[in-house]
């Protein structure tokens, strides 16, 4: 028998520095977790102790903190090289800055293979990107070889900016011939490494013949066997065993997100490549693991540029940006409108001639807007200003919801109106009218939404049974501020870009902003 140790990360999302337990900015260092310096300590410890070790990443290193905003992927290549990753799969967020923003900082600089079997380049891009990413790679590990085959969510064109010269094929259809090719090359130990979410990971394990292990990402799935060490609730045991259609027992793993855990899976293969045992657990990278001093010093060196960036002007406002709780928790506020407009703008994807865009709606809990921005400072808006407005380090995500769920959400928005509670919704692409004289749960008297399947966008009444795409904070997608109906009834959820980054990009693009209060939210009683 031959034993392989698979160390894996996914959805690190720019968390190069250690973070607090909830993966936001580290405040109390003695309680902080993750970060590449701490990760390196643990990886090196395992590499020294065990003979056959692979360090793999299942995508979405890009996007999530000011590190990505400033360094645009160069930081990913640099620190992944320093940690000596063996392979990485492309995630949807790797395309956030377009194909060029992937090629130059990451694909050309990475000293490890970057993989995806279901992304096919066409047109002029085909020759430009040729060899920079691969469908699979055969890696020597000790005296053996291991095949790694990559895959990426086929929803990427709706979630990021891959452009028109990349075709995202069905994962299973694309993977099978590559796995077959590996088999003809006498590679009998094959890992599928990819970024399509836990449900697809399980389908790949079930349907793609010849795959021995699936290492996934995208859905931030936490798996654990035994008592979990932190706040994350396991979605199943680690590894999660899937029985394939032909009867193979295929371990599927994922390691939550944000570099909080290092996935640790031990696989025993026989001489024919049969998996005869698999066991392990994610390792919580808490403060009991010291940060590696040399990596930490390098982080501190790179950090300097971030501090300078925070105070640089992104753009100007010529109006007061009202982000006060007195406004945003009670009525339409122009800061809410600005943020929602930025959220929609960040999700412009013209992927179908029938649609002007795939999504037109935004909702945003008023309680998530934490500060106004005064225009009487020469109109200057900085990253620092935006960090005061959006201090929680969240993401603006894409969900699919039925009209009936949206109606419940808007009823919840005003169910206890007047108490300055955070659930009051700011909107974009939505016109809502409330009648507060009616009983809670029956206060939405009009709810019109902006069409997407139209050449001239206009507002139409919400249809209860129709499925709509909506951009919202991850906080709401996870049921925050009492929006349990969103969490329970959402039909799809894809994590998006860092909140501050979305707004800062929009302001930089617009250069001068002047958001107004324009009648998106109305009260039929006339008293507001």
């Amino acid at each position: 028998a031959w034993e392989l140790t698979i160390l894996h990360t996914n959805d690190v999302h720019s968390r190069l520095e250690q973070t607090s337990e909830d993966s936001s900015k580290c405040v109390n260092a003695s309680r902080c977790m993750g970060g590449v310096a701490r990760l390196f300590t643990k990886v090196q410890q395992i590499r020294r102790a065990e003979p056959n070790v692979l360090l793999l990443d299942a995508g979405d290193q890009y996007q999530g903190t000011i590190w990505f905003t400033v360094y645009k992927g160069a930081e990913v290549a640099h620190f992944m090289n320093a940690l000596r990753y063996d392979a990485m799969a492309l995630g949807n967020h790797e395309f956030d800055n377009g194909v060029e923003g992937l090629i130059e900082p990451l694909l050309k600089e990475a000293k490890f293979p970057i993989l995806s079997a279901n992304i096919k380049a066409k047109g002029p891009l085909a020759s430009q990107i040729s060899g920079l990413y691969l469908p699979y790679k055969v890696l020597p590990v000790g005296d053996e070889v291991v095949g790694i085959v990559g895959y990426t969510s086929k929803e990427t064109p709706f979630l990021s900016n891959p452009g028109t010269n990349l075709v995202f094929e069905d994962e299973i259809t694309a993977l099978q011939p590559e796995v077959d090719k590996l088999k003809t090359l006498n590679v009998n130990k094959i890992i599928a490494l990819g970024h399509s979410g836990f449900e697809m990971d399980k389908l790949i394990a079930q349907k793609v013949r010849g795959v021995d292990v699936v290492v996934g990402g995208h859905s931030n799935t936490f798996l654990y066997t035994g008592n979990p060490p932190s706040k994350e609730v396991p979605a199943g045991k680690y590894p999660f065993i899937v029985t394939s259609d032909d009867g193979r027992k295929v371990p599927v793993v994922q390691a939550y997100a944000f570099g909080k855990y290092l996935g640790y899976l031990k696989i025993e293969f026989d001489e024919r490549g049969n998996v005869i045992s698999s066991h392990g657990n994610p390792i919580l990278l808490n403060s009991s693991i010291p940060e590696d001093p040399s990596i930490k010093a390098d982080i501190n060196k790179w950090r300097i540029k971030l501090d300078n960036y925070s105070t640089q002007e992104l753009g100007k406002t010529i109006v007061y940006l009202d982000g006060s709780s007195q406004s945003c928790r009670f009525r339409e506020c122009n800061m809410g409108n600005l943020i929602c407009d930025a959220m929609i703008n960040n999700n412009l994807r013209h992927t179908d001639e029938m649609f002007w865009n795939h999504v037109s709606m935004c909702i945003l809990n008023g309680g998530g807007i934490r500060s106004p921005i005064d225009e009487r400072n020469n109109g200057t808006i900085t990253w620092e200003n935006l960090a005061a407005v959006l201090p929680f380090g969240g993401t603006f995500d894409l969900v699919q919801l039925k009209g009936s769920t949206l109606k419940k959400a808007f009823e919840h928005s005003v169910h206890r109106y007047g108490q300055s509670t955070g659930e009051f919704l700011q909107v974009g692409g939505i016109h809502v009218v409330y009648d507060l004289s009616r009983k809670p749960g029956d206060r939405v008297v009009k709810l019109d939404v902006l069409c997407t399947k139209c050449r001239v966008p206009s507002y139409d009444p919400l249809k209860m049974d129709e499925v709509y795409k909506v951009i919202l904070p991850n906080f709401l997608a996870n049921g925050g501020d009492g929006f349990q109906m969103i969490k329970d009834e959402l039909l799809r959820h894809d994590s998006g870009d860092q909140d501050i980054n979305v707004v800062s990009t929009y302001i930089s693009k617009m250069k001068v902003i002047y958001p107004a209060v324009e009648g998106r939210i109305k009260f039929s009683t006339g008293s507001h």
Epitope: R209, G210, T243, G247, R248, D270, R272, G273, N274, I276
Partner: antibody, heavy 119, light 107 residues
């Protein structure tokens, strides 16, 4: 070395049941499927089904569904195949074999157990 | 279920002869084709897996080829110990199925 040792020959009456054992040694018993194949006198090989001792998952062919039960006792690395409501045409040599799941070939076989069904 | 048809059902050959046995599947089995040898009163032995890969300890005079639905077992120079019955088996789709066998006899 890797081997499978089966229980001895059995003579049964029609309508009765038979339980054949297959003891594994020399490998990780819980890591491979145990396949059951039978061969009637002068005939070819017929796959009956399989069990994965690691989690007791089973697969039976349609023909034997409802009549065959495959079990495994991991504490003694032994698999069992029980066939009920025996008929005379169940007279055969019953083999257990270890299945390789990369190609679904059977690389190690037991010596076979002869089951005779006769009134 | 996938049907496996072997031909011939029996053949007579002499020591040193080149012998070819064919196996046809009722549908494409993607090279998941295995060959076994069985001698009277003994359990089958694996010879070749995945169309052409020799099982450990099997002499190199045995070889396999084929793709899609048609597969071949070749014995390049028949030896006295090779007189036996040969079975093909598909490992592509459950339930696993065997060919009816080819008996190789001494001429």
């Amino acid at each position: 070395q890797v081997q499978l040792v089966q229980s001895g020959a059995e003579v049964k009456k029609p309508g009765a049941s038979v339980k054949v054992s297959c003891k594994a040694s020399g490998y990780t018993f819980t890591g491979y499927w145990i396949q059951w194949v039978r061969q009637a006198p002068g005939q070819g090989l017929e796959w009956m089904g399989a069990i994965y001792p690691g989690d007791s998952d089973t697969r039976y062919t349609q023909k034997f569904q409802g009549r065959v039960t495959m079990t495994a006792d991991t504490s003694i690395s032994t698999a069992y195949m029980e066939l009920s409501r025996l008929r005379s045409d169940d007279t055969a040599v019953y083999y257990c074999a270890r299945g390789n799941w990369d190609d679904w070939d059977f690389d190690v076989w037991g010596q076979g157990t002869t089951v005779t069904v006769s009134s | 279920d996938i049907q496996m048809t072997q031909s011939p059902s029996s053949l007579s050959a002499s020591v040193g002869d080149r012998v070819t046995i064919t196996c046809r599947a009722s549908q494409d089995i993607s090279n998941y084709l295995n060959w076994y040898q069985q001698k009277p009163g003994k359990a089958p032995k694996l010879l070749i897996h995945y169309t052409s890969r020799l099982h450990s300890g099997v002499p190199s005079r045995f070889s396999g080829s084929g793709s899609g639905t048609d597969y071949t077992l070749t014995i390049s120079s028949l030896q006295p110990e090779d007189f036996a019955t040969y079975y093909c088996q598909q490992g592509d789709t459950l339930p696993w199925t065997f060919g009816q066998g080819t008996k190789v006899e001494i001429k």
